[in-house]
């Protein structure tokens, strides 16, 4: 399956309007930097087949969705840059999905890698509650953000590895 | 490879302007933000100020601000340091250095080289 | 702003010695705090960040520990290429500052 190139810059768009978000100076939240185990061997993309890979990256896209689908996140961020924001996710999500279908008996293995998904949905379990333990304060969404953002730039260079494996 | 390259060596003389730069590549220069230091001959050093090259915003330490100026220019990946009027007190040495703002990363890992300015009549 | 106190400001060593330095923040800084190395010409390097966490290519014989005020960073067998001067910087709030500096000087 291809990715189309659409989703590279939907994915492009997503960095930039993340980058728009930002409600106040990130200066004056350095007291409140976290370390949220970014699972960096996730997105090697070395031990994945495909249709792995493709897999994580639908999780961490989905999970992105629903930490800022929450009511706390509406309550933070302008309501126009989110909805934008939903627009480029669900763009990404249903080119993923559509890849996954087109893997389905390409390859002998499993579509998905059952561990890689929950190390993903764990690392979200830990964002939750660093934002819940900060009570949703404005500088917790900040450094929030800029995980998100790290996230969704790492990621990006795994969807380019696998663009380059076509 | 990461790599922070500053500009070269300048002699100037009081009351001059100058402008010094800090040329980012080999990662994305707007991820980062950029601090730079002082260390003056013989001393230890001293935190000067910082730049979000995304949306230069900037920030001065007290004994700085209003002395120099911290710029960037994310299109050519530079952050620049500026002075208007060069004093004999300004003669040191200046560092470049990048710290991943709020993520969880090593503050202050890679720096450049270092411009040496020398201030004298 | 918070001041970060070194010490002792020099010391003499020999090749094998164990070498402790102290840094002590002006108050709590939690685990913000970063040690680095710098030669005579050359560009500070990261050792040490987060107090405890040594970076990347940088020899295990180097550690870190401490938290709140109290910190210290520690180099269990001392090589020569370790005489140098030591820094510690605070990285909870800006602006960041950095201790006075600690010379290893060869005994």
């Known amino acids: 399956c291809d990715l189309p190139q659409t989703h590279s810059l939907s994915n492009r768009r997503t960095l930039m309007i993340m980058a728009q978000m930002g409600r106040i100076s990130p200066f004056s939240c350095l007291k409140d930097r976290h370390d949220f185990g970014f699972p960096q061997e996730e997105f090697d993309g070395n031990q994945f087949q495909k249709a792995q890979a493709i897999s994580v990256l639908h999780e961490m896209i989905q999970q992105t969705f629903n930490l800022f689908s929450t009511k706390d996140s509406s309550a933070t961020w302008d309501e126009t840059l989110l909805d934008k924001f939903y627009t480029e996710l669900y763009q990404q999500l249903n080119d993923l999905e559509a890849c996954m279908m087109q893997e389905v008996g390409v390859e002998d293995t499993p579509l998905m890698n059952v561990d890689s998904i929950l190390t993903v949905r764990k690392y979200f379990q830990r964002i939750t509650l660093y934002l819940t333990e900060k009570k949703y304060s404005p500088c917790a969404w900040e450094v929030v953000r800029a995980e998100i953002m790290r996230s969704f730039s790492l990621s990006a260079n795994l969807q380019e590895r696998l663009r380059r494996k076509e | 490879e990461v790599q922070l390259v500053q500009s070269g060596a300048e002699v100037k003389k009081p009351g001059e302007s100058l402008k010094i730069s800090c040329k980012g590549s080999?990662?994305?220069?707007?991820?980062?933000?950029i601090g730079w230091v002082r260390q003056m001959p013989g001393k230890g050093l001293e935190w000067m100020g910082i730049?979000?090259?995304?949306?230069?915003?900037?920030r001065y330490s007290p004994s700085f601000q209003g002395q120099v100026t911290i710029s960037a220019d994310k299109s050519i990946s530079t952050a620049y340091l500026q002075w208007s009027s060069l004093k004999a007190s300004d003669t040191a040495m200046y560092y470049c250095a990048r710290h991943p703002g709020l993520n969880w990363a090593p503050d202050f890992d890679y720096w450049g080289q270092g411009t040496l300015v020398t201030v004298s009549s | 702003d918070i001041q970060m106190t070194q010490s002792p400001s020099s010391l003499s060593a020999s090749v094998g010695d164990r070498v402790t330095i102290t840094c002590r923040a002006s108050?709590?800084?939690?685990?913000?705090l970063n040690w680095y190395q710098q030669k005579p010409g050359k560009a500070p390097k990261l050792l040490i960040y987060a107090a405890s966490s040594l970076q990347s290519g940088v020899p295990s014989r180097f550690s870190g520990s401490g938290s709140g005020t109290d910190f210290t960073l520690t180099i269990s067998s001392l090589q020569p290429e370790d005489f140098a001067t030591y820094y510690c910087q605070q990285a909870i709030d800006l602006p960041f500052t950095f201790g006075q500096g600690t010379k290893v000087e060869i005994k």
């Open positions: 730049i979000d090259p995304s949306d230069s915003d900037t």
């Open positions: 108050q709590s800084i939690n685990r913000f």
């Open positions: 080999g990662y994305s220069f707007t991820s980062y933000w």
